[in-house]
Interface confidence: low
């Protein structure tokens, strides 16, 4: 017997569907109507045939009352080839729901997204996470998707993007966006970052994550942020292979005074990089290759400095973080 594709937990909180059959019974997903957190994985299926069975242009207001009754707040859709028209139809219906967080992963979006009809209402998401999503429309995908969202988006995460640079002239500002995560785009690089950080389109960013994005120096990142007018409070540059030295011909970059937390862990650093902000609340240099204790004049003024897992403290050992239990367990670097 084949296992049930959908499983709802005992608290009716989380429902996970794995549709791996060539002709899945999509009606099985109805058991998820009572769940707050829903995950639907489509096993790599092409959802093109769906367009024949649904009227993507139908007025979604006819479903408004039903959709409003759904408890779903977090929805993950993964592993499918989705026509843009179908995605738009789903977004139009979900606009009447109480959905707050949407994650799309391992999707191939085919075709172009039509513009938002005048009478249509956007989806009031607080968080949108995309991982390994490809769009037929290339660089204009964010602008096309953005018009289907209300302007209150607070968290945007884009990982393994096929086109992490955006068509900036088409993108509208994200006035409420406080967290932007472009991590796990190893081909991005500092020039790509400049292209992705559309100037003045991210005025409210407080947290910027750039883990594993091909960044080379903190100074190069500083220049990209300055060019875009982005002034994060917290910047994560961990898991990049960073150079400690600055190109002498490169102009000095003044970090924004708003920046108070900088993560440079797992960056392969053999010394504290030059060109750091003069003052920080938090600096994480853990799991690097520092062979000696940094001298005070090499460091910014910092209230909380983490140096766990560097060779000068002894190879392979680490120290507890502030607030962590000193259990003797060594975090692996």
């Amino acid at each position: 017997t084949t296992p049930e594709p959908c499983e709802l937990d005992d608290e009716d909180f989380r429902c996970v569907c794995n549709f791996s059959e060539p002709q899945p019974d999509w009606s099985e997903a109805f058991q998820c109507v009572s769940a707050v957190e829903v995950e639907i994985h489509a096993g790599g299926l092409n959802l093109e045939p769906f367009l024949k069975r649904v009227d993507a242009d139908a007025d979604p207001r006819q479903y408004a009352d039903t959709v409003k009754a759904l408890r779903v707040r977090r929805l993950t859709v993964g592993a499918a080839q989705v026509p843009a028209q179908l995605l738009v139809g789903a977004l139009r219906v979900l606009a009447y729901s109480r959905l707050k967080e949407l994650t799309l992963e391992d999707l191939k979006i085919t075709g172009t997204m039509p513009p938002l009809p005048l009478e249509a209402t956007g989806l009031a998401l607080s968080s949108l996470r995309l991982r390994n999503v490809s769009w037929a429309t290339g660089r204009s995908w964010l602008a096309e998707l953005q018009q289907w969202l209300k302007p209150g988006l607070k968290v945007l995460s884009i990982a393994q993007a096929h086109s992490p640079a955006f068509s900036c002239e088409q993108v509208r500002a994200f006035p409420a966006l406080t967290s932007l995560d472009l991590s796990d785009n190893p081909g991005l690089g500092e020039r790509g970052l400049m292209a992705a950080l559309c100037p003045h389109k991210f005025p409210a960013i407080q947290n910027l994550a750039l883990r594993n994005t091909g960044m080379e120096t903190p100074t190069g990142v500083c220049a990209a942020l300055a060019a875009a007018g982005v002034q994060p409070h917290s910047l994560d540059l961990s898991h990049n292979s960073l150079r400690a030295t600055v190109n002498p011909s490169a102009p000095r970059c003044m970090w924004s005074s708003a920046l108070n937390s900088l993560n440079l862990s797992f960056a392969g650093l053999e010394q504290v990089p030059k060109g750091l902000p003069a003052k920080l609340r938090v600096l994480d240099l853990s799991c690097n290759r520092l062979n000696r204790a940094p001298q005070p004049d090499e460091l910014p003024e910092v209230d909380n400095l983490t140096l766990d897992g560097n060779p000068f403290l002894v190879p392979g050992t680490a120290l507890p973080h502030e607030g962590s239990m000193n259990s003797g367990v060594v975090p692996a670097c």
Partner: nanobody
Framework: QVQLQESGGGSVQPGGSLRLSCSRS????????MGWYRRAPGEQRELVAS???????TYADSVKGRFTISRDNTMNTVYLQMNNLKIEDTDVYYC????????????WGRGTQVTVSS
């Protein structure tokens, strides 16, 4: 939050030895110095010995050649090996962590009594 806990104090005859230990919990910063101070009743605390994260040591003139400060590799524990103890070494010994970051901060243990008498 940093916490320091001393152990190893006690009574010993002149010429004897004691080993004090100070266990630290909380983070270690590159600019930290850990040390031992002592204070007799009514006196100011005076530095006995200190050690930095990088391993640099400092001693009071009165204990040079008799006392040795050391640490484990993670600086979770700092030791003070006291040899050839003298009656004038009798004091309460306090573990100290000095952190020079944006501002200089001192953290103290509660102290351990060392008594040298014949």
């Amino acid at each position: 939050q940093v916490q320091l806990q001393e152990s190893g104090g006690g009574s010993v005859q002149p010429g004897g030895s004691l080993r004090l230990s100070c266990s630290r919990s909380g983070p270690i910063y590159s600019v930290d110095t850990m040390g031992w101070y002592r204070r007799a009743p009514g006196e100011q605390r005076e530095l006995v010995a200190s050690i930095t994260v990088g391993g640099t040591t400092t001693y009071a003139d009165s204990v040079k050649g008799r006392f040795t400060i050391s640490r484990d590799n993670t600086m979770n524990t700092v030791y003070l090996q006291m040899n050839n103890l003298k009656i004038e070494d009798t004091d309460v010994y306090y573990c100290n962590l000095n952190r020079r970051l944006a501002k200089s901060e001192d953290y103290w243990g509660r102290g351990t009594q060392v008594t040298v008498s014949s």
